[in-house]
């Protein structure tokens, strides 16, 4: 039996700059029941606070709701582990909510097969930013990727589309069913999960319909 090992905060993420969660790895428990607490202060303040919500984001986590989240201040966060034999603390972690955004995936992914005047067909992929993202005001600047593959294939073909919410894919195989997904990343943030798959079958022969 021994004091607990040093915990480590390994991840902090915000879906929208309005709330965020930090998760920690507990470290060894020293063979004894061990309690964990997360404490934090904000830049320029001496007051230390305890985690407002240990439950919402699951085990070994702290959720900061809107009421506790500010993009104007750096959070200095520490996790403390305590058992009957002693205690240990993680290194202090500095968190700027602006830089931990991992948004929800883009939505409304639509696939349309189109034809150029020269009869060349292409797939027109369109999507919308995630619901929570206030892209229009510049609060978020999003970059996007799409990926697609024939249904039976292993490898995805990835296209970076920049800030565009549409993309044209040429040279696809006629008669093949393609799966398509999209994801987004804010400036200075993290890629979202890939969206749900949408699928489309490229026609063998294509008659232009107006």
């Amino acid at each position: 039996q021994s004091p607990p090992g040093k915990p480590e905060i390994h991840k902090c993420r915000s879906p929208d700059k309005e709330t965020f969660t930090c998760w920690w790895n507990p470290g060894t428990d020293g063979g004894l029941p061990t309690n964990y607490s997360l404490t934090y202060s904000k830049e320029g303040e001496k007051t230390t606070y305890e985690c407002p919500d240990y439950k919402t984001s699951g085990p070994n986590s702290c959720f900061f709701s809107k009421q506790y989240t500010s993009i104007w201040k750096i959070y200095i966060i520490t996790v403390n582990a305590t058992n009957q034999m002693g205690s240990s603390s993680s290194d202090p972690l500095y968190v700027d909510v602006t830089y931990i955004v991992e948004p929800e995936p883009p939505r409304n992914l639509t696939l349309e097969v189109k034809q150029l005047k020269d009869k060349k067909t292409y797939l027109w992929v369109k999507w919308s930013p995630p619901t929570i993202t206030d892209v229009k005001t510049g609060w978020f600047t999003m970059e996007y990727e799409i990926r697609l593959k024939p249904e039976e294939a292993e490898e995805w073909e990835i296209h970076f589309t920049g800030h565009q919410t549409q993309f044209k894919v040429f040279d696809l195989y006629p008669g093949q069913k393609y799966l398509v997904q999209t994801r987004c990343k804010p400036d200075h943030g993290y890629w979202s999960r890939w969206s749900q798959e949408s699928s489309v079958e490229m026609p063998n022969d294509f008659t232009l319909k107006d």
């Epitope: 480590e8 390994h10 830049e43 993009i71 104007w72 972690l93 500095y94 700027d96 602006t98 993290y190």
Partner: antibody
Framework: QVQLQQPGAELVMPGTSVKLSCKAS????????IHWVKQRPGQGLEWIGE????????NYNQKFKGKATLTVDRSSSTAYMQLSSLTSEDSAVYYC???????????WGQGTLVTVSA | DVVMTQTPLSLPVSLGDQASISCRSS???????????LHWYLQKPGQSPKLLIY???NRFSGVPDRFSGSGSGTDFTLKINRVEAEDLGVYFC?????????FGSGTKLEIK
Amino acid sequence: QVQLQQPGAELVMPGTSVKLSCKASGYTFTSYWIHWVKQRPGQGLEWIGEIDPSDSYTNYNQKFKGKATLTVDRSSSTAYMQLSSLTSEDSAVYYCGRSFFTNWFAYWGQGTLVTVSA
Amino acid sequence: DVVMTQTPLSLPVSLGDQASISCRSSQSLVHSNGNTYLHWYLQKPGQSPKLLIYKVSNRFSGVPDRFSGSGSGTDFTLKINRVEAEDLGVYFCSQSTHVPFTFGSGTKLEIK
């Protein structure tokens, strides 16, 4: 404790390439961005770029695009920077640095002195 | 790119004196999120730089309170009260509001 270990020096021929390493320890490697900074003798610091070890996403200073390539090896918790087509202008100390969940960095390696000379 | 201009280039001081270093940016360092990402580093001879101050005025963990930062917009100052021998080295200001991040050319704090 957090450590970023870099080799002390590399002597390389003009026109060749060099791959600098930065081995991270004391924390979860994939959690935090790694930055690279150049310092020429007796001069200021230049930010080269950054890489997110979790997915190898990179941001570069335009000035170093085509000169520097940032990569990571997650299995060994090591970040790399390859410098290509070396000239005497590339002779410098190169530092790796680690951010928190912030856009500034507080942990630095000891730096690798690259000397380009025939 | 944002140009960071530091003055003076060299600052001779006596131990116990106050030192003041100025840093001016070629454009405002106020980020679209309202924060100002201006930081100060100290590089001692033969060492890598160490963070002293982040976001204009916040001392990093373990930095003595004789170091203080101030300023806004494009004009910033680092003050060192009662300079000690261990404070000698080159001080750099740095901005991370705009990509690419940029640094000042450095101010060498040395004994008179």
